[in-house]
């Protein structure tokens, strides 16, 4: 129960964050124009990884696409790169995962197989998570470096009087939100991979033992007790839910060891 | 067709206060923002204070104190509160309408005249 | 403030003549983010409103007869009427339409020589 129930939320959590890693690298809102200590202009600049936007006091908003591949600098190109790699390991590990849900029964697979699959889809969203956190930190980076280097030259003199205001920007509310969505996939990948370790079927020693009465091919197993003998290695741990009679075929199913209450 | 209104001009004494009216027709206040500019007899033109679309004001800073920008959206009208009326607010106050893009005053109205006086 | 300064302050122009009006601003008025200049022109007519007839710096307002032309771009800016009629005599203004308060220059008044 504890770990379908750590699958299921370690799947909403990913979905959350993967959702958000979408969100944030659609969003305009990676830079925005820094209001802090400048002069009260009638437009506000903001930009995002594949567009700039104006936005004026009239309610008028312009964006303008960054119709250039070569032209662009070369970490904003890295980070769309790794919020796009973000994006589509998340989408697979999402696919993924979605089939290795205990609570979801496809055919006969195995809990060996949706194990592999918890395990596989839990790196993916690891991955996922950290290509977003890193995208969002290398363009912030970028941002504050920018940031000091205009501050610097903030007012460039022109003939004594004249000034250029230059535009400083500073962190998009896209930044928090990849930031919390790469967290959030993070955490739903660990709690994947965490739930792997429960779903996967252990080796025992313990096996059904069968008690052949003389003269009867019945197996009586007492409820409730795990006998065992050092034969049948295919056997598995299994719960008996009545003291009743069984056949020696049905020794050799195959539950999982969390069917114990 | 775009028309701008303004009423409420007169003579009044110095430190007294005086509401003045713009009615908008043509266009909605909720989609233009609205200005009112003075201009002082025989000198040029001074911006005194917006009213956006969504209800943002800007104000002159030197007259900020004293002046009140608002709007009635279900009335169509702009008004401009003045307070503490000095001779040197004695002027032709005009209300224009944004034009949205590129922030300019397209439609202006014909204007009222205040004059500050004892 | 943003001082915005005109220059003449009077220009006298022979009927069809280009007539050139400059205006300068203390701060750049060019916003990086569209390269766009945030600059209008007005015309002035004794006893009348102000009528818009350049924005953006360069933009002509719908119904403006296209001998007024507008130039320039960060701080300095040019109004040129390419052939001055006499219906042109009036009071021209420049105005910064970017940093708050939206201010205008003191004004040119054009005249016929």
């Known amino acids: 129960m504890a770990v379908t129930a750590c699958q299921g939320l370690g799947f909403v959590v990913s979905l959350i964050g993967i959702a958000g890693i979408i969100a944030a690298t659609c969003m305009d809102q990676w830079s925005t124009q820094d209001l802090y200590n400048n002069p009260v202009t009638a437009v506000f600049n903001y930009q995002g990884l594949w567009r700039s936007c104006v936005r004026e006091s009239s309610g008028f908003t312009e964006c303008r696409g960054y119709f250039t591949l070569l032209g662009l600098p070369a970490m904003l190109q890295a980070v769309r790169a790794l919020m796009i790699v973000g994006i589509v390991l998340g989408a697979i590990g999402l696919l993924v995962s979605i089939f290795a849900l205990k609570c979801i029964r496809i055919g006969s697979m195995e809990d060996s197989a949706k194990a592999n699959m918890t395990l596989t889809s839990g790196i993916m969203f690891i991955v996922s998570g950290l290509c977003a956190i890193a995208g969002v930190s290398v363009f912030a980076n970028m941002l504050v470096t920018n940031f000091w280097m205009s501050t610097a030259n903030m007012y460039t003199g022109m003939g004594g009087m004249v000034q250029t205001v230059q535009t400083r920007y500073t962190f998009g509310a896209a930044l928090f939100v990849g930031w919390v969505a790469g967290g959030l996939t993070l955490i739903g990948g660990v709690m994947m991979c965490i739930a792997c370790r429960g779903l996967a079927p252990e080796e025992t020693n313990y096996k059904a033992v069968s008690y052949h009465a003389s003269g009867h091919s019945v197996a009586y197993k007492p409820g409730g007790f795990k006998a065992s003998t050092g034969f049948g290695s295919n056997t598995k741990n299994k719960k008996i839910y009545d003291g009743g009679a069984r056949t020696e075929d049905e020794v050799q199913s195959y539950p999982s060891k969390h069917d114990y209450v | 067709q775009v028309q701008l209104v303004e009423s409420g001009g007169g003579v009044v004494q110095p430190g007294r206060s005086l509401r003045l009216s713009c009615a908008a027709s043509g266009f909605t206040l909720t989609s233009y923002g609205v200005y009112w500019v003075r201009q002082a007899p025989g000198k040029g033109l001074e911006w005194v204070a917006v009213v956006w679309a969504g209800g943002n004001t800007n104000y002159n800073s030197a007259l900020m104190s004293r002046f009140t920008i608002s709007k009635d959206n279900s009335k169509s009208t702009l008004y401009l509160q003045m307070n503490s009326l000095r001779a040197e607010d004695t002027a032709v106050y005009y209300c224009?309408?944004?034009?949205?893009?590129?922030?300019?005053?397209?439609?202006w109205g014909q204007g009222t005249l205040v004059t500050v006086s004892s | 403030d943003i001082v915005m300064t005109q220059s003449p302050d009077s220009l006298a122009v022979s009927l069809g003549e280009r007539a050139t009006i400059n205006c300068k601003s203390s701060?750049?008025?060019?916003?990086?983010?569209?390269?766009?200049?945030?600059l209008a022109w007005y015309q002035q007519k004794p006893g009348q409103p102000p009528k818009l007839l350049i924005y953006?710096?360069?933009t002509r307002e719908s119904g403006v007869p296209d001998r007024f032309s507008g130039s320039g771009s960060g701080t300095d800016f040019t109004l040129t009427i390419s052939s001055l009629q006499a219906e042109d005599v009036a009071v021209y203004y420049c105005q910064n339409d970017y940093f708050f308060p939206f201010t205008f220059g003191q004004g040119t008044k054009v005249e016929i020589k």
């Open positions: 953006g710096a360069s």
């Open positions: 701060q750049s008025l060019l916003n990086s983010g569209n390269q766009k200049n945030y």
């Open positions: 224009a309408r944004d034009r949205g893009r590129l922030l300019a005053m397209d439609y």
